[in-house]
């Protein structure tokens, strides 16, 4: 499973959309978690509504919001007021009982707001986004950038 790389500016919002096979994942809740290390468990940040039919309702934990469009097969996570400490590796998951299937791995990069940094030239964003093989890199500097990931096979 490839890791998707998303960039957001500190203080702004980053929206992540993970798509999945709506039939295969029928009836399953979705979750967003932080991967603190390869060996350790993925630490749950937020999950969709406990009643699957109400999964379209937004669920919030702190500054992270999740909502699931179960018909379209798209779960959307919004990281509001992005902080430096939010940078890291995350997963979109589909929950089945106590088991969790990884829908997408997401590496979140938080960039300094140039307006907060008088020497903004010191923050370097490469022109070539594909400098890391196997990683999709998307620059998100708008307040509501939405990125859709293709369904995983």
């Amino acid at each position: 499973l490839n890791t998707t790389v998303l960039q957001g500016m500190a203080g702004q919002s980053l929206r992540v959309s993970c798509t999945y096979d709506a039939l295969k994942h029928w009836g399953r809740r979705k979750a967003w978690c932080r991967q603190l290390g390869e060996e350790g468990p993925c630490q749950r940040v937020v999950s969709t509504h406990g009643v699957w039919l109400l999964a379209f309702l937004k669920k919030r934990n702190g500054s992270t919001v999740i909502a699931d469009d179960t018909l379209a097969g798209t779960v959307t996570i919004t990281l509001k007021n992005l902080q430096a400490g939010d940078a890291g590796l995350y997963q979109c998951q589909s929950l089945r009982g106590r088991e969790a299937e990884v829908l997408q791995k997401v590496l979140v990069e938080v960039l300094e707001d140039p307006l907060d940094d008088q020497d903004a030239g010191d923050l370097w964003v490469p022109e070539e986004s594909s400098s890391f093989e196997g990683a999709q890199v998307e620059h998100s500097t708008s307040r509501n950038q939405e990125t859709s990931f293709p369904p995983t096979s």
Epitope: T3, V5, Q7, R34, Q35, L36, G37, Q43, Q83, A84, G85, A87, G88, L89, K105, L107, E109, L111, E112, L123, W124, V125, P126, E128, S129, S131, F132, E133, G134, A135, V137
Partner: antibody, heavy 115, light 107 residues
Framework: QVQLQESGPGLVKPSETLSLTCTVS????????WSWIRQPAGKGLEWIGL???????IYNPSVKRRVTMSVDTSKNQFSLKLTSVTAADTAVYYC?????????WGQGTLVTVSS | EIVLTQSPATLSLSPGERATLSCRAS??????LAWYQQRPGQAPRLLIS???NRATGIPARFSGSESGTDFTLTISSLEPEDFAVYYC?????????FGQGTKVEIK
């Protein structure tokens, strides 16, 4: 098991450029972030900066006008360059994987700034 | 930048005793705090992440807690290999910063 190994000159002259490379083995460099941290003898730890998967960098303001970090994915390496060094830059330099926290470290390399 | 102040600077204890190390942040770090152990001549090792989560392979005698901007590392019963320097580190805001360290030495 991920392993990190720092390499580079152990002695650098004042006003010259310190250059170090960190080689990552046992895993791909491309799915994580990577930091440099230094420790003067008998003192505490100072974070120098990090390089993201995309190649974007965040530097500590204390050194940001003198520091450059880069990555070479084909060699599974990332590097540090620190210009205009002085005796105050003498320290053990560590590279580390920055996955929310520094979970893997190199063993460190001592760099002495002296003429 | 966020300043982390560790206390005491040195803690003199005997094996089997309980060690309590403190780290105070100059502002909120939202639980984004870690503890590291550094033995002489070695690189630091991650013990605790997110203020209270033990890292993989770390013995249960190590535990972390928080109360606002005050963080505590507790070693319930010191083993000979636990005598080392301990650092706290925040990654709530750039630049990532470390405390100045607490040395746990044999009494």
């Amino acid at each position: 098991q991920v392993q990190l190994q720092e390499s580079g000159p152990g002695l650098v002259k004042p006003s010259e450029t310190l250059s170090l490379t960190c080689t990552v083995s046992g895993g791909s460099i491309s799915s994580y972030y990577w930091s440099w941290i230094r420790q003067p003898a008998g003192k505490g730890l100072e974070w120098i900066g990090l390089i993201y998967t995309s190649g974007s960098t965040i530097y500590n303001p204390s050194v940001k006008r003198r520091v450059t970090m880069s990555v070479d994915t084909s060699k599974n390496q990332f590097s540090l360059k620190l210009t205009s060094v002085t005796a105050a830059d003498t320290a053990v330099y560590y590279c580390a994987r920055d996955l929310f926290y520094f979970d893997y470290w190199g063993q460190g390399t001592l760099v002495t700034v002296s003429s | 930048e966020i300043v982390l102040t560790q206390s005491p600077a040195t803690l003199s204890l005997s094996p089997g005793e309980r060690a309590t190390l403190s780290c105070r942040a100059s502002q909120s770090v939202s639980s984004y705090l870690a503890w590291y152990q550094q033995r002489p001549g070695q690189a630091p090792r991650l013990l605790i992440s997110d203020a209270s989560n033990r890292a993989t392979g770390i013995p249960a005698r190590f535990s972390g807690s928080e109360s606002g901007t005050d963080f505590t590392l507790t070693i319930s019963s010191l083993e000979p290999e636990d005598f080392a320097v301990y650092y706290c580190q925040q990654r709530s805001n750039w630049p990532w910063t470390f405390g100045q360290g607490t040395k746990v030495e044999i009494k």
